[in-house]
C-alpha cells in the first residue's frame, strides 16, 4: 500500500526526478556534468533564471559555485542548494517592497514583469 | 509560463505559509505548528528525529521560531533524504 | 593567546558545539592592528575542501577533524607581519553569511 | 574612511563592489560591527536581512554593485567600525571598513 504524497513530497518528488532526467544521460547517472546542467537550466529554469541563461559563462559560473567539493560534477546535494537558493529569491521577490501587516504575495521569479 | 520544477518551487512557499500564517506572524512557524508540518508534510524517516530535535536545529538563530530560511534547511535535508531513499528503493526492485 | 617565536609554525584551533558541524562552512578571518578584516580561507567541513585567499596560500593551512567538531588552521614560516588577532567563523550554506564567530587567538609573533 | 554622526540623526554608509555580488536573484552582501575587543558581528546579510539580535534601527539596501547599510537614529552604542563583505565568491572580501564616531 503506497500512502499518499504530502504537498512537500510531491514538490521534493518533481526536484529529484527533474534531477535523475538529466543525471542519467551522460557518464554518471547519478551526477549532473555541465552539459546535463546547462541542458537543464534552460528548460526546467527558463523562468526563474531567464536573465542568466542569456549567457553561457553565467551558467557556467552557478554551477561551479554549486560545485561545493570542486569534482567538475553536482551531485544531488549540490544541486539541491540551488533549488533552495531559487526558493528564498523567489520567496524575497513575492515581499519587495513589502509594508504594514496583513501576508500577501506578489509574482515570484521568472512571474510577472522583470 | 512556468515549468513544472519551477511550479514546485513556488509550492514549497506555499507549504510554509500554511503553517506561519496559523499563528499571525507570517514568517514564523513555532514548536507546536513545526510539530504539525512534520506530521503533515514529512515522511517517516524526516518525523522519527522528533520535532524538538529539529526545532532546536533549524532555529539557527535561536528566536523560538523557524524562519523561512531555517525551513529550507527542513527541505534540503528532507530532499537529500529522499534522493537516498530512491536508490535505495530502485535497488529493491 | 600565543606568543611565538619568528620562524616557527602554530596551530589555532576552533571547537564548534550546539549545531551540526558539516552544515556550515568553517572561515577563518585576520584582523590586524584592531582595523582592518581579511578573509584567510574557508574549509567545508563535509568534504573537506578548502579555499584560500591568494595572499595566504602556503602560509596558512586549513583542516577539520570531524569527529571532535574542530577546525584547525596552521599557519608557518611566523614573521612580525603575522601578529594579529584570529578569527573562526561558521557560514551558513544556504545564503552564505558568518552568523557566529570565535572570540578570537591573538597571536604575537617574536624575533 | 570615518564618519561622524549626531546622536539621534541618522547615519549611511555606503559600498560599492568591483562587480555584482548578485547571484540566483540573491545579493550575496552582508554587513558587520566592529567593537575593539569584540569578534564582529553580523547586522545585515543578503543585502537587506536582519541578523538575529540586531536593533531595528539598523537596515541595508542595494543590489548588484552599490549597498548601503542605514542607522535611523545614531545610539551612542554604534560608534564602531563597519565593515561590508561579499560572499558571492571566493575569495570572500571585506571592505576597508568605515569608522563611525559621534559627532
Known amino acids: 500500500m503506497t500512502c499518499k504524497m504530502s504537498q512537500l513530497e510531491r514538490n521534493i518528488e518533481t526536484i529529484i526526478n527533474t534531477f535523475h532526467q538529466y543525471s542519467v544521460k551522460l557518464g554518471h547517472p547519478d551526477t549532473l556534468n555541465q552539459g546535463e546542467f546547462k541542458e537543464l537550466v534552460r528548460k526546467d529554469l527558463q523562468n526563474f533564471l531567464k536573465k542568466e541563461n542569456k549567457n553561457e559563462k553565467v551558467i557556467e559560473h552557478i554551477m561551479e559555485d554549486l560545485d561545493t567539493n570542486a569534482d567538475k560534477q553536482l551531485s544531488f546535494e549540490e544541486f539541491i542548494m540551488l533549488m533552495a537558493r531559487l526558493t528564498w529569491a523567489s520567496h524575497e521577490k513575492m515581499h519587495e517592497g513589502d509594508e504594514g501587516p496583513g501576508h500577501h504575495h506578489k509574482p515570484g521569479l521568472g512571474e510577472g514583469t522583470p | 509560463m512556468l515549468t513544472e520544477l519551477e511550479k514546485a518551487l513556488n509550492s514549497i512557499i506555499d507549504v510554509y505559509h500554511k503553517y506561519s500564517l496559523i499563528k499571525g506572524n507570517f514568517h514564523a512557524v513555532y514548536r507546536d505548528d513545526l510539530k504539525k508540518l512534520l506530521e503533515t508534510e514529512c515522511p517517516q524517516y524526516i518525523r522519527k528525529k522528533g520535532a524538538d530535535v529539529w526545532f532546536k536545529e533549524l532555529d539557527i538563530n535561536t528566536d523560538g521560531a523557524v524562519n523561512f530560511q531555517e525551513f529550507l534547511i527542513l527541505v534540503i535535508k528532507m530532499g537529500v533524504a529522499a534522493h537516498k531513499k530512491s536508490h535505495e528503493e530502485s535497488h529493491k526492485e | 593567546p600565543e606568543l611565538v617565536k619568528s620562524g616557527a609554525s602554530v596551530k589555532i584551533s576552533c571547537k564548534a558545539s550546539?549545531?551540526?558541524?558539516?552544515?556550515?562552512?568553517i572561515n577563518w578571518v585576520k584582523q590586524s592592528n584592531g582595523k582592518s578584516l581579511e578573509w584567510i580561507g574557508l574549509i567545508n567541513p563535509n568534504y573537506g575542501t578548502t579555499f584560500y585567499n591568494q595572499k595566504f596560500k602556503g602560509k596558512a593551512t586549513l583542516t577539520v577533524d570531524q569527529s571532535s567538531s574542530t577546525a584547525y588552521m596552521q599557519l608557518n614560516s611566523l614573521t612580525s607581519e603575522d601578529s594579529a588577532v584570529y578569527y573562526c567563523?561558521?557560514?551558513?550554506?544556504?545564503?552564505?553569511?558568518?552568523?557566529?564567530w570565535g572570540q578570537g587567538t591573538t597571536l604575537t609573533v617574536s624575533s | 574612511a570615518s564618519l561622524a554622526v549626531s546622536l539621534g540623526q541618522r547615519a549611511t554608509i555606503s559600498c560599492r563592489a568591483s562587480?555584482?555580488?548578485?547571484?540566483?536573484?540573491?545579493?550575496?552582501m552582508n554587513w558587520f560591527q566592529l567593537k575593539p575587543g569584540q569578534p564582529p558581528k553580523l547586522l545585515i546579510y543578503?543585502?537587506?536581512k536582519q541578523g538575529s539580535g540586531v536593533p531595528a534601527r539598523f537596515s541595508g539596501s542595494g543590489s548588484g554593485t552599490d549597498f548601503s547599510l542605514n542607522i535611523h537614529s545614531m545610539e551612542e552604542d554604534d560608534t564602531a567600525m563597519y565593515f561590508c563583505?561579499?560572499?558571492?565568491?571566493?575569495?570572500?572580501?571585506f571592505g576597508g571598513g568605515t569608522k563611525l564616531e559621534i559627532k
Open positions: 562587480e555584482s555580488v548578485d547571484i540566483y536573484g540573491i545579493s550575496f
Open positions: 543578503a543585502a537587506s
Open positions: 567563523a561558521r557560514e551558513t550554506l544556504l545564503l552564505r553569511y558568518f552568523d557566529y
Open positions: 550546539g549545531y551540526s558541524f558539516t552544515d556550515y562552512n
Open positions: 563583505q561579499q560572499s558571492k565568491e571566493v575569495p570572500r572580501t
